[in-house]
């Protein structure tokens, strides 16, 4: 991506769906009626025009927030406790990367609004899901309903890491 | 990647009882929804209902309440399919389905690996 | 039960041209619709998951849209593989249910 994001950023972030997949407790099908449109700005992973700065802050605030998500008490209630704290160490270590790579795109001159405005969005689309699980007194399908979503948001997120990573290598060999 | 095997045609007689299995390979997870699905000859596919393998959660379309019964054996990966009271009308091709999308994306509610289908006929 | 209606439930169509199936569901589903594609003796393709999400290795000339009670599945430009029966499915609720299929012929 343009700086010192390891390789293996793209395994960290398929390994961060996997654990969310294992932790899974009931089955979705169980769930139907609790689900909960939490308008996840699409527009924001779905644009042509990527800029690395923007992916950067994007893919920072999503596994920032999931982090605070899952490091609650009430999480911890929820989930079985070795997936999540395996989840814990992989999203410091993407953090830790990230954290790193936007100094360095923050000093090569991208604008800081890519940066704050993403952050700002994010913040208010996870302030939903914690509506959401407190409104549901943070029951089993509550979790399972905001699991899901975390999945779908971060796939998302992690898809337009790819594509930044393909444009990259593209411009690279021509 | 995850395959799903389903055992052979059945051939049965009206008022028989019928078992298909359909045993999970691969990058398999005990916690995948099976879902049943069917197709008579030339027609369109019906939803029969789903299972947790792991929790043994199960749903049942209401057409087949009392007739259907879906179970797991998840030592073996293996989900079965059992219709008893058989009638002509059930003469259709039997699919298993993963609940799920191909990738890790967080929709369960889409089928995305299906079985080859197991063939029954209800015939006197 | 919460019926889907496929139309037209046949089509005649060339290689190239724009194809476009319609679902309509009887009450509102929301997004919870996926299209499936099947071809004669195969077992049913995942193409398209909740409403417009393509399935992994599925061509970007098949596109879905709608909400609701009313949802499309566009073929941009066909091409010869693309000759099959579509299906959309709902999961809004119990029981899970199919539309009745569009086939797609050669003209």
């Known amino acids: 991506l343009g700086c010192d994001l390891p390789q293996n950023h793209g395994l960290l972030s398929r390994n961060t769906l996997v654990l969310l997949h294992q932790m899974r407790r009931i089955s979705p099908f169980l769930c139907l009626k609790d689900r909960r449109d939490f308008r996840f700005p699409q527009e924001m992973v779905k644009g042509s025009q990527l800029q690395k700065a923007h992916v950067m802050s994007v893919l920072h605030e999503m596994l920032q927030q999931i982090f605070s998500l899952f490091h609650t008490e009430r999480s911890s209630a929820a989930w079985n406790m070795t997936l999540l704290d395996q989840l814990h160490t992989g999203l410091h270590q993407q953090l830790q990367h990230l954290e790193t790579c936007l100094l360095q795109v923050v000093g090569e001159g991208e604008s800081a609004g890519a940066i704050s405005s993403p952050a700002l969005t994010l913040r208010r689309y996870f302030q939903g899901i914690r509506v959401y699980l407190k409104e549901k007194k943070y029951s089993d399908c509550a979790w399972e309903v905001v699991r899901m979503e975390i999945m779908k948001s971060l796939f998302l997120s992690t898809n337009m890491q790819e594509r930044l990573r393909s444009k990259d290598r593209d411009l690279g060999s021509s | 990647q995850v395959q799903l095997v389903q055992s052979g045609a059945e051939v049965k007689k009206p008022g028989a009882s019928v078992k298909v299995s359909c045993k999970a390979s691969?990058?398999?997870?005990?916690?995948?929804?099976i879902n049943w699905v069917r197709q008579a000859p030339g027609q369109g596919l019906e939803w029969m209902g789903w299972?947790?393998?792991?929790?043994?959660?199960?749903g049942y379309a209401q057409k087949f309440h009392g007739r259907l019964t879906l179970t797991s054996n998840s030592s073996i990966s293996t989900s079965y399919l059992e219709l008893s009271g058989l009638r002509s009308e059930d003469t259709a091709v039997y699919y298993c389905?993963?609940?799920?999308?191909?990738?890790?994306?967080?929709?369960?509610?889409?089928?995305?690996?299906w079985g080859q289908g197991t063939t029954v006929i209800v015939s006197s | 039960d919460i019926q889907l209606t496929q139309s037209p439930s046949s089509l005649s169509a060339s290689v190239g041209d724009r194809v476009t199936i319609t679902c309509q569901a009887t009450?509102?589903?929301?997004?919870?619709l996926n299209w499936y594609q099947q071809k004669p003796g195969k077992v049913p393709k995942l193409l398209i998951y909740?409403?417009?999400n393509l399935e992994v290795g599925v061509p970007s000339r098949f596109s879905g849209s709608g909400s609701g009670t009313h949802f499309t599945l566009t073929i941009s430009s066909l091409q010869a593989e693309d000759f099959a029966t579509y299906y959309c499915?709902?999961?809004?609720?119990?029981?899970?249910?199919f539309g009745g299929g569009t086939k797609v012929e050669i003209k």
């Open positions: 389905a993963r609940a799920g999308t191909s990738t890790l994306t967080g929709h369960y509610f889409a089928l995305g690996v």
């Open positions: 691969g990058q398999t997870f005990t916690s995948d929804d």
């Open positions: 299972r947790n393998p792991n929790t043994q959660d199960t």
């Open positions: 009450q509102d589903i929301s997004k919870y």
């Open positions: 909740e409403t417009s």
């Open positions: 499915q709902q999961y809004e609720n119990f029981p899970f249910t």
